[in-house]
Interface confidence: low
């Protein structure tokens, strides 16, 4: 079988949800000594970076200006050391936001509930869209989808303190083009005192940790390069 290098890690710096006309930055973290990194969009090559000097940096950044719906979609990256190519990274979905209109988010029975109560969020947007998305701040990768012509429901079932937090919703014009975010709705869940420690569904790391951890090599880093790669995959 054809030998390949371990796959790189692709990340969006700060967030994968980029407001239209703003700049997105994607990072591809590969390996010290990589002489070339390629960014692919929807399966096609779009950009090439060649770090200088290659042995001193373990990844590159790709800057994408002026975000719009044509640039939103699935990105991946690969890298090369000598003549040997890596496997392709996982796919990263880059989303453009602030398209068209702003939805309204409400919660029933209200923003303050007791543990065990059933809660439903409602996201409403009057312009033509059929898909709605609900995100909890700090958990933007956990997107709940719901469908409806003008309004969508997001039933949460019986809530626990793990559901506490601020929520926003978006209308979606396709998988990668979202509306402006709604105003946040803060859900306060009281009770269930013995269960207020971190629940498994809570984020261990906030979104702001989703940054580009590219490092310049020192002697110590060279020894830790393999561990760094393994640790990053474990974190994912």
């Amino acid at each position: 079988p054809k030998q390949t290098l371990p796959k790189p890690i692709i990340r969006a710096e700060s967030t994968y949800m980029v407001p239209k006309e703003k700049q997105a930055t994607l990072c591809c973290q590969g390996s010290y000594g990589a002489v070339e990194y390629q960014l692919h969009f929807e399966g096609s090559l779009f950009a090439v970076e060649r770090p200088k000097p290659p042995e001193r940096i373990n990844g590159v950044k790709f800057h994408i200006p002026d975000m719009n719906s044509r640039k939103a979609g699935r990105y991946s990256c690969i890298y090369r050391v000598g003549e040997l190519w890596s496997e392709r990274s996982d796919l990263l979905d880059l989303v453009v936001t602030e398209m068209y209109d702003t939805p309204t988010l409400s919660v029933h029975p209200g923003p303050e509930v007791t543990s065990g109560e059933k809660v439903t969020f409602y996201c409403r947007l009057d312009t033509a869209t059929s898909m709605f998305l609900l995100l909890k701040e700090g958990r933007s990768r956990d997107v709940q989808r719901s469908y409806g012509k003008v309004q969508a429901e997001f039933p949460m079932g019986p809530v626990t303190t793990a559901h506490r937090g601020s929520y926003r919703c978006f209308g979606s014009y396709n998988n990668y083009a979202w509306s402006f975010p709604s105003e946040p709705v803060k859900l306060l869940v009281t009770g269930d005192i013995e269960n207020t420690s971190l629940a498994p569904t809570d984020p261990t790391f906030p979104d702001s940790w989703d940054t580009c951890l590219l490092t310049r090599e020192t002697g110590l880093q060279k020894d830790l390069a393999l561990w760094d790669h393994t640790a990053q995959n474990l974190l994912r």
């Epitope: 006309e21 930055t25 096609s44 090559l45 790709f62 200006p65 002026d66």
Partner: antibody, heavy 125, light 107 residues
């Protein structure tokens, strides 16, 4: 809409200097690579050089044929690109275009989605 | 530098014809290739980038294909406004380089 409006061409003697300008509008100028491309009369397109976006440090690259004689600069506050041409030669005679590098310029290359109208530079004694 | 070679250098065709222009790179460039159309006295216009992606606003009769070193621009049904010179350009590495052009003339 995106517009690139060029100025500054003309007739110049061999060894002389000339500065071309390209005024940009309709997009966030500092976010984009900007390039100069030339076309000698009746000939094909030849890349002259580019200046990278602010995110890539605003650094420049030049074709071997102009390196050391031509300088590309940009003023992001004025949304303007410049090409300073010194030690001009007869073979520099061409129509010069400024062009915007498209969205996926990397540190290595670009394609060009918007072009200026071109400005003629004639080097002759 | 990567050399780009276009063929043919010129061709004569009639309205409605299917026209194919080829471009060959001196080394592999993946799918990092763009095509431009230039009419006399005008600036070039981007038609296709990344070998096969149609630039916004370009008619669907234009299509591109290829990867590695060999690329093709096809006009499925030539229209009067398509008589022009076409250039390929690699956007794989610096310096970006252009083919010498293919002039499409009326038969």
């Amino acid at each position: 809409q995106v517009q690139l409006v060029q100025s500054g061409g003309g007739l110049v003697k061999p060894g002389g200097s000339l500065r071309l300008s390209c005024a940009a509008s309709g997009f966030t100028f500092s976010d984009y690579y900007m390039s100069w491309i030339r076309q000698a009369p009746g000939k094909g397109l030849e890349w002259v050089g580019f200046i990278r976006s602010e995110a890539y440090g605003g650094t420049t690259e030049y074709a071997a044929s102009v390196k050391g004689r031509f300088t590309i600069s940009r003023d992001n506050s004025k949304n303007t690109l410049y090409l300073q041409m010194n030690s001009l030669r007869a073979e520099d005679t061409a129509l010069y275009y400024c062009a915007r590098g498209d969205r996926y310029c990397s540190s290595t290359s670009c394609w060009f989605d918007y072009w200026g109208q071109g400005t003629l530079v004639t080097v002759s004694s | 530098d990567i050399q780009m070679t276009q063929s043919p250098s010129s061709l004569s065709a009639s309205v409605g014809d299917r026209v194919t222009i080829t471009c060959r790179a001196s080394q592999g460039i993946s799918n990092a290739l763009a095509w431009y159309q230039q009419k006399p006295g005008k600036a070039p216009k981007l038609l296709i980038y990344a070998a096969s992606r149609l630039e916004s606003g370009v008619p669907s009769r234009f299509s591109g294909s290829g990867s590695g070193t060999d690329f093709t621009l096809t006009i499925s049904s030539l229209q009067p406004e398509d008589f022009a010179t076409y250039y390929c350009q690699q956007h794989y590495s610096t310096p970006p380089t252009f083919g010498q052009g293919t002039k499409v003339e009326i038969k």
